[in-house]
Interface confidence: low
């Protein structure tokens, strides 16, 4: 019988005995960075290197004994779960284990910050194919380790690390707070959040996502074919960092934003009970349990978006909140959410070099949250084109002028503590569907990315009635690059993306006022990439897909029209 | 302890020649600031992690770390030098008094300090 | 078909070391560990050692550690056992038999025709 | 390490007989994951190599005769010979390799 976590990452139509090759991950080297291990265990043995390095505080107690078994339990349970041959999830990986963690699985930062240079220092002196560095521990907030943990995956490291077992905000812990890290909760059997004692897994905007951490089978150092079953964050860590060594050995040319990218689409989707987490933390944390892709050729033909939540604000009243992507990545669009209601918008603004999502509080508001619309699109040139408070009834409109841009994100800021309802009209001008459109008194920016093969398409869905929520999704094959609310009255609290849908929240029905004031459109704009398309047929060799085009350009919007009769 | 006492006896003997021609004054620009850990059962004073300017070769580490020495020395506080990063970020690992933060702070080359802390198993 | 074909009979001295080959043959070497058992004269089985050939990994029963080293030679798919410092009490026939390297099939299929050592003075 | 006591050392039996060996091991040989007792049993006639009769307790090793059966789990386990044939009569070994491997001293079947 195959373990249920290993079921569980198997993609649905396929048998996880059949499916998880004795080589998976072959081409991948994972370093591990834990307790001491038993590399002779059966799982495991002839494919964990046990390096020199070890770097651990004393225990505590004066009655400590020393057990081998004890000693090596958490590290050795991991590398089974990371690669072992039995109950492993990527058979074929090579591991190299430090030790940075005590008998009592105790550590320092300094101990793992040594840990990771001296990663970083072998991976100069013998380059091997990609690496993925496993962190299955957590302390507090640390700026010099998530320092350390950014640099290492600017030299294209993939870390992976536990979001941790203290049933609070991941965000309050590291290395589970570096944006750079892969940071990883954990679901049980049931895909219910786990609980571990009175504590838990923790949750929160910087958990990418969940994977099995409860009851998981794996080498147990009682002794070399004993297995034991743990739970906790670093059982589900060591899913990811084994998938991501399947997923790197079949495209070993993968970066970390598109490892990231591919790890969030093919997860799981909407399982989790979100009960579980806190209420102000239910919209942060991704609802999202890891799995295999369902094929080792690449999936480099879509389009991969995903949604990143800045910090909050704080309540003063000139806060603001910034999100930003990853550094591989495009921002596409931009978007707030404050619980209160009271935002003065968002707004898309260089810094350094990089557009970055800005919210904004406003007066008597309890805080914003901007949030990022972040994707890969590669040979993208993006632009963002303002257009200032129209101050006339019509509200205030931009649009993509230049030739070949199309739109991807509409925002909208405003200085005025409240914009009140003054409606702006919700339909456009038929022809120009590529405009974004907002109130009279706030400024409108528009995401306007030219790529090749781009193409996009806005769809609405407007509830007359007033509605906590508004959804309109983006139809298979289709990317959401952008989400945004019309009109942006004050009983709107904000739209953001989730997965594949555009979510717009309003206040409480009964505190809004009449039914025209609660009327409120949810606005998704939907991209796709031929050109990564094409790209993708033309590497895989495949004449099978022929039609494609055809529907393509049946289906295809031009948003240039007005351009055309210039020609 | 011992050994630490020997220590001290080298460093304020092969530092405190280097030390009197070094000024105390940092880099113009930012000062530099200190962290800790939020959570106090797991801070480590004693230990602290000091993290150098991006661009700051190991020379300079290195050089940053004996002047610490030399004037904790001259004020008579024993520091001993646990590792000097170099590859993933500029800076040392340092042993000393709490007391010699305001001083450590003030150093060329120096963007943050932190006291060392726990890590856990999850 | 599937054989494991050991070298010959050895007499040693006290103190010499002996080395013994075991050549597969009718499968995949590298799919199966290698195993080292001994019988002494009118005595039972006494596991020795594995090595994994595909990675080279070797495991050594206590009693031997420090006088054993298995290795092998994968382009002849031959497996070694040699033990050194031989005493009287080493006199044994010496097996290897593999085991296929998979999840929890620990147990020995095949076994070598096996190599009686006599240590003698 | 774990310690494997057969009994008995010896018997003497006739062709047709059923025949039981017993094997203790000083600690349970259940493997919790995949709920199977790592224990084989082998036989040896004179002069001969070992062969493997039995694994995993009770499962038999192809072309091995179904007279021969296993069975028991943790730390008590039997082998069976339902009716003894006279290519039977040899030195019976059970093996445990639940941590690392080690054999019962043997129990040595004879023709009475």
């Known amino acids: 019988s195959i373990p249920w976590n290993l079921e569980r990452i198997t993609p649905p139509r396929y048998r996880a005995d059949e499916y998880q090759p004795p080589d998976g991950g072959s081409l991948v080297e994972v370093y591990l960075l834990d307790t001491s291990i038993q590399s002779d265990h059966r799982e495991i043995e002839g494919r964990v290197m046990v390096t020199d390095f070890e770097n651990v505080p004393e225990e505590d107690g004066t009655r400590f004994h020393r057990q081998a078994s004890k000693c090596d339990s958490h590290g050795t349970h991991l590398a089974g779960v990371v690669s072992g041959r039995d109950a492993g999830v990527a058979k074929g990986a090579s591991m190299r284990s430090l030790r940075v963690l005590n008998c009592q699985g105790k550590g320092t930062v300094s101990g793992t910050l040594i840990g990771l240079e001296f990663i970083r220092k072998s991976q100069l002196v013998q380059p091997v194919g990609p690496l993925v560095v496993l962190l299955p521990l957590a302390g507090g907030y640390s700026r010099v380790l998530n320092a350390a943990c950014q640099r290492l995956a600017r030299a294209g490291v993939v870390l992976v690390t536990a979001a941790g077992n203290f049933r609070d905000d991941a965000c309050l812990y590291s290395p589970a707070s570096a944006p750079e890290v892969i940071t990883v909760g954990a679901t049980n059997a049931q895909d219910q959040p786990v609980t571990l004692g009175t504590l838990g897994t923790n949750f929160g905007r910087c958990v990418d996502l969940f994977a099995p951490g409860e009851d998981i089978i794996g080498a147990s150092s009682d002794c070399s074919t004993c297995f034991v079953s743990q739970s906790g964050t670093s059982q589900a860590a060591a899913h990811v960092a084994g998938i991501a060594a399947m997923m790197l050995s079949a495209e070993p040319e993968l970066t970390l934003a598109e490892l990231r990218q591919r790890l969030i689409h093919f997860s799981a989707k909407d399982v989790i009970n979100e009960a579980w987490f806190p209420e102000d933390q239910r919209v942060l944390t991704p609802n999202l349990v890891a799995a295999l892709p369902p094929s080792t050729h690449g999936a480099g033909w879509q389009l991969f978006c995903r949604t990143v939540w800045s910090a909050h604000s704080g309540p003063t009243r000139m806060a603001t909140a910034v999100a930003r992507c990853a550094p591989d990545e495009e921002l596409l669009s931009c978007s707030s959410f404050s619980r209160s209601g009271k935002r003065r918008g968002e707004r898309m603004e260089a810094q350094g070099g990089k557009l970055v999502c800005r919210a904004h509080n406003a007066f008597g508001g309890e805080g914003v949250y901007a949030i990022a619309r972040c994707c890969l699109l590669p040979q993208a040139n993006c632009s963002v084109h303002t257009a200032p408070p129209a101050e006339a009834s019509m509200g205030t409109r931009v649009h993509c002028h230049q030739q070949g841009h199309v739109l991807t994100g509409c925002s909208s800021h405003w200085e005025v503590e409240d914009l009140g309802t003054h409606k702006p009209p919700v339909l456009r001008p038929r022809g120009q569907p590529n405009q974004c459109v907002g109130h009279r008194e706030a400024s409108i920016h528009a995401s306007c990315c030219h790529a090749p093969g781009l193409e996009c398409k806005v769809k609405e869905h407007g509830i007359p009635a007033p509605q906590e929520q508004v959804t309109v999704a983006c139809e298979e094959g289709w990317t959401l690059t952008g989400c945004s609310a019309l009109p942006g009255t004050s009983h709107v609290l904000g739209a953001y993306a989730v997965d594949n849908t555009c979510v717009v929240r309003s206040r409480d029905v009964s505190t809004t006022g009449s039914t025209s004031e609660g009327a409120v459109t949810a606005v998704a704009i939907c991209c796709r990439s031929r050109h990564l398309a094409q790209a993708s047929q033309e590497l895989q060799g495949s004449t099978s897909g022929s039609g494609l085009n055809d529907i393509f350009e049946a289906q295809k919007i031009e948003w240039h029209e007005h351009h055309h009769h210039h020609h | 302890q011992e050994d630490e006492d020997g220590d001290y006896e080298e460093l304020v003997l092969a530092l405190r020649s280097e030390e009197d021609g070094l000024a105390e004054a940092p880099e113009h620009g930012t000062t530099a600031t200190f962290h800790r850990c939020a959570k106090d059962p797991w801070r480590l004073p004693g230990t602290y992690v000091v993290v150098l300017k991006e661009e700051t070769h190991l020379s300079q580490s290195e050089r940053t770390a004996r002047r610490l020495q030399a004037q904790a020395a001259r004020r008579g506080y024993l520091t001993k030098i646990l590792h000097v990063f170099h590859g993933l970020l500029p800076g040392f690992l340092v042993k000393m008094s709490g007391d010699l933060l305001e001083l450590a702070l003030k150093l060329p080359h120096v963007d943050y300090i932190e006291e060392d802390s726990s890590v856990f198993a999850q | 078909q599937v054989q494991l074909v050991q070298s010959g009979a050895e007499v040693k001295k006290p103190g010499a070391s002996v080395k013994v080959s075991c050549k597969a043959s009718?499968?995949?070497?590298?799919?199966?560990?290698m195993h080292w058992v001994r019988q002494a004269p009118g005595q039972g089985l006494e596991w020795m050692g594995y090595?994994?050939?595909?990675?080279?990994?070797?495991k050594y029963h206590q009693n031997f550690k420090d006088r054993v080293t298995m290795t092998r030679d994968t382009s002849i798919s031959t497996a070694y056992m040699e033990l050194s410092r031989l005493t009287s009490d080493d006199t044994a026939v010496y097996y290897c038999?593999?085991?296929?390297?998979?999840?929890?099939?620990?147990?020995?299929?095949?076994w070598g025709q096996g190599t009686t050592v006599t240590v003698s003075s | 390490d774990i310690v494997m006591s057969q009994s008995p050392s010896s018997l003497s039996a006739s062709v047709g007989d059923r025949v039981t060996i017993t094997c203790k091991s000083s600690?349970?040989?259940?493997?919790?994951?995949?709920?199977?007792?790592?224990l084989a049993w082998y036989q040896q006639k004179p002069g001969k190599s070992p062969k493997l009769l039995i694994y995993w307790a009770s499962t038999r090793e192809s072309g091995v005769p179904d007279r021969f059966s296993g069975s028991g789990s943790g730390t008590d386990f039997t082998l069976t010979i339902s009716s003894l044939q006279p290519e039977d009569f040899a030195t019976y070994y059970c093996?445990?390799?639940?941590?690392?491997?080690?054999f019962g001293q043997g129990t040595k079947l004879e023709i009475k």
């Open positions: 009718g499968y995949t070497f590298t799919d199966y560990w």
């Open positions: 038999a593999r085991q296929y390297d998979y999840d929890e099939d620990w147990y020995f299929d095949v």
């Open positions: 093996k445990q390799s639940f941590n690392l491997f080690t």
């Open positions: 600690q349970s040989l259940l493997n919790s994951r995949t709920r199977k007792n790592f």
């Open positions: 090595i994994n050939p595909s990675s080279g990994f070797t």
